[in-house]
């Protein structure tokens, strides 16, 4: 069953997904979709990367981390209850039936009414947006040859630990690793 993640209305939700490129610049296409991963591709695509850059994204959906190092975790800005549901992170490893598919369940809770708003963590301060991950940064100049020559060594995704978007700083320590090969 899919791993569950939580965020409050008005927060930024964080859905973790990682892989390890075999070498710098040897990126693998990734897609994020709303809904469980289908047999092929992603349904209802909200963001997609190619071998060089983020080549498609929709409003409120962006990559926060360094996707060129394999951090393809999805951030959803200012979530509402309608953002609840299952999301698919698909790491599109070249070759037949090689894709790694991860279904992540996002549960949106009503915003808490708190008398001390200063005690709330500023999520976006902890994770400032990187414009380069939204398709406006410099493109990789390396030209990939045959895609199947990419030798992925690892696919990583968070397994069980993250239960609230405000724990995102602890994200890296919670990852389960899947080896390809």
């Amino acid at each position: 069953s899919e791993v569950e993640y939580r965020a409050e209305v008005g927060q930024n939700a964080y859905l973790p997904c990682f892989y390890t490129p075999a070498a710098p610049g040897n990126l693998v296409p990734v897609c994020w979709g709303k809904g469980a991963c289908p047999v092929f591709e992603c349904g209802n695509v909200v963001l997609r990367t190619d071998e060089r850059d983020v080549n498609y994204w929709t409003s409120r959906y962006w990559l926060n981390g360094d996707f060129r190092k394999g951090d393809v975790s999805l951030t959803i800005e200012n979530v509402t209850l309608a953002d609840s549901g299952i999301y698919c992170c698909r790491i599109q490893i070249p070759g037949i039936m090689n894709d790694e598919k991860f279904n992540l369940k996002l549960v949106i809770k009503p915003a808490k009414v708190t008398p001390a708003p200063t005690r709330q963590r500023d999520f976006t301060a902890a994770f400032p947006r990187m414009l380069t991950t939204r398709g406006h940064g410099p493109a990789e100049t390396q030209t990939l040859g045959s895609l199947p020559d990419i030798n992925l060594t690892q696919i990583s995704t968070l397994a069980n630990e993250l239960r609230d978007s405000r724990l995102a700083n602890d994200l890296r320590d919670s990852g389960a690793t899947i080896r390809i090969g």
């Epitope: 047999v39 092929f40 349904g43 070249p94 037949i96 039936m97 895609l147």
Partner: antibody, heavy 116, light 107 residues
Framework: EVQLVESGGGLVQPGGSLRLSCAAS????????MSWVRQAPGKGLEWVAN????????YYVDSVKGRFTISGDNAKNSVYLQMNSLRAEDTAVYYC?????????WGQGTLVTVSS | ETVMTQSPAILSVSPGERATLSCRAS??????LAWYQQKLGQAPRLLIY???TRATGIPARFSGSGSGTEFTLTISSLQSEDFAVYYC?????????FGQGTRLEIK
């Protein structure tokens, strides 16, 4: 208007070969996965094969693997199904369809009859 | 493979009435399910995808619901042109599979 037109069906003996063609129009062919789905006479639908846009990946149902080959030609906006070592159970109407997971639209179909 | 079972095999309904068609998956397919309509001698036509999203040009009287293993196609007020065979199809698990179909006939 999006349109798919199949051709190449006919009567063939067991063990024989046929090549089906599907001509696409009304959309950017190179941007889409294309699929073949078949329907035996009076029976239900069975997904047969599909090809990823650009042709880098091709997938087949087990019953045709090693006998059928799907291919595409972006210059001709066409997808093909080469069928070898045909068997009686391959008798069906073969439909070409756009899409990888769900299929829309479909061509009108072409009948393949495998019989001696 | 994921077996898709449709019920009933034949459904007799009068024009203007509601028709409810069922589709059950042998394992979860989440919401990765489509519905098609096929009239005699014609190719199938996509009605619904993602379990509940109507395809382009499909009238609002067609609606889909369900997730996991249980799905329903509802036609709220049957028109004469709606009498046909209906197929469900899952695209969550390999390989893609269809149900055996439900024939909707005039009562």
């Amino acid at each position: 208007e999006v349109q798919l037109v199949e051709s190449g069906g006919g009567l063939v003996q067991p063990g024989g070969s046929l090549r089906l063609s599907c001509a696409a129009s009304g959309f950017t062919f190179s941007s889409y996965w294309m699929s073949w789905v078949r329907q035996a006479p009076g029976k239900g639908l069975e997904w047969v094969a599909n090809i990823k846009r650009g042709g880098s990946e091709r997938y087949y149902v087990d019953s045709v693997k090693g006998r059928f080959t799907i291919s595409g030609d972006n210059a001709k906006n066409s997808v093909y199904l080469q069928m070898n070592s045909l068997r009686a159970e391959d008798t069906a109407v073969y439909y070409c369809a756009r899409g990888s997971n769900w299929f829309d639209p479909w061509g009108q179909g072409t009948l393949v009859t495998v019989s001696s | 493979e994921t077996v898709m079972t449709q019920s009933p095999a034949i459904l007799s309904v009068s024009p203007g009435e509601r028709a409810t068609l069922s589709c059950r998956a042998s394992q979860s397919v989440y919401s990765n399910l489509a519905w098609y309509q096929q009239k005699l001698g014609q190719a199938p036509r996509l009605l619904i995808y993602d379990a509940s999203t109507r395809a382009t040009g499909i009238p609002a009287r067609f609606s889909g619901s369900g997730s996991g293993t249980e799905f329903t196609l509802t036609i709220s007020s049957l028109q004469s042109e709606d009498f046909a065979v209906y197929y469900c199809q899952q695209y969550n698990n390999w390989p893609i599979t269809f149900g055996q179909g439900t024939r909707l006939e005039i009562k």
